[in-house]
């Protein structure tokens, strides 16, 4: 089968890192500088990604795999394969078209990326606010007044996965 296939297509035996070179009577040639082929049987090699500007090289290009980029300090990756770099903000801020802006009252962001989210509404769960929220931190909900019988002291931080304002199903 291998012999039959290679008679039909001389390119099928070209390994990753080479290409089937029409200029050389379809024999396998090594990929040229700054290019790669990650699979066998390729008729061209792909140009290596170049990590320039705000991108920096996380993994060099080789003849069989593309370069991988990440972002310079102060920026973070967005998109598949780090296709974009977005500016970091401080905790308590979000990135807008005009740059980093503090979270509005009643919202918080505990990361250097993403948007400000509303504080958890403790009363929706029948609970009280134990620790007030800040720009950087969500509120901490405490037990409901009915739970405050002697000897009971269960402090429940809000579940981070639940969307604010929604009560459990």
């Amino acid at each position: 089968f291998e012999r039959t296939r290679s008679l039909q297509d001389p390119c099928s035996n070209c390994p990753a890192g080479t290409f089937c070179d029409n200029n050389r009577n379809q024999i396998c040639s090594p990929c040229p500088p700054n290019s790669f082929s990650s699979a066998g049987g390729q008729r061209t090699c792909d140009i290596c990604r170049q990590c320039k500007g705000v991108f920096r090289t996380r993994k060099e290009c080789s003849s069989t795999s593309n370069a991988e980029c990440d972002c310079t300090p102060g920026f973070h990756c967005l998109g598949a394969g780090c296709s974009m770099c977005e500016q970091d903000c401080k905790q308590g801020q979000e990135l807008t078209k005009k740059g980093c802006k503090d979270c509005c009252f009643g919202t918080f962001n505990d990361q250097k990326r993403g948007i400000c989210r509303p504080w958890t509404n403790c009363s929706l769960d029948g609970k009280s606010v134990l620790v007030n929220g800040t720009k950087e931190r969500d509120v901490v909900c405490g037990p409901s007044p009915a739970d405050l019988s002697p000897g009971a002291s269960s402090v429940t931080p809000p579940a981070p996965a639940r969307e604010p304002g929604h009560s459990p199903q």
Epitope: N23, R24, P30, P33, S63
Partner: nanobody, 121 residues
């Protein structure tokens, strides 16, 4: 131009080893890659292994783990160490040098005269 002279071929038993050498002379400063190919009677010339000026190596699947390509810059020589040889490795082995890439093709493409490798008991 680049001149290439291969040596080291011969008759060897299955499971044996050989080391082929390819000595380059001439305009060797412009070599981007050195490669070994082989051609059995009535077959096309097949890629075996290559090594670039940066030291990156590539092997055909059929020889991976058995053959090793290397080079000695001081001697302008490229080697192909062949271990665990099989009868199907029998072929004429050719050394090839490729010049720099001009965007569409390699600027030059030189071949040695070939050296016969026969694997037989």
């Amino acid at each position: 131009a680049v001149q290439l002279v291969e040596s080291g071929g011969g008759l060897v038993q299955p499971g044996g080893s050989l080391r082929l050498s390819c000595a380059a002379s001439g305009s060797i400063f412009s070599i981007y890659a050195m490669a070994w190919y082989r051609q059995a009677p009535g077959k096309q010339r097949d890629f075996v292994a290559s090594i670039t000026s940066g030291g990156s190596t590539i092997y055909a699947d059929s020889v991976k783990g058995r053959f090793t390509i290397s080079r000695d810059n001081a001697k302008n020589t490229t080697y192909l160490q062949m271990n665990s040889l099989k009868p199907e490795d029998t072929a004429v082995y050719y050394c090839n040098s490729l010049g720099s890439w001009d965007g569409e093709r390699y600027e030059y493409d030189y071949w040695g005269q070939g050296t016969q490798v026969t694997v037989s008991s």
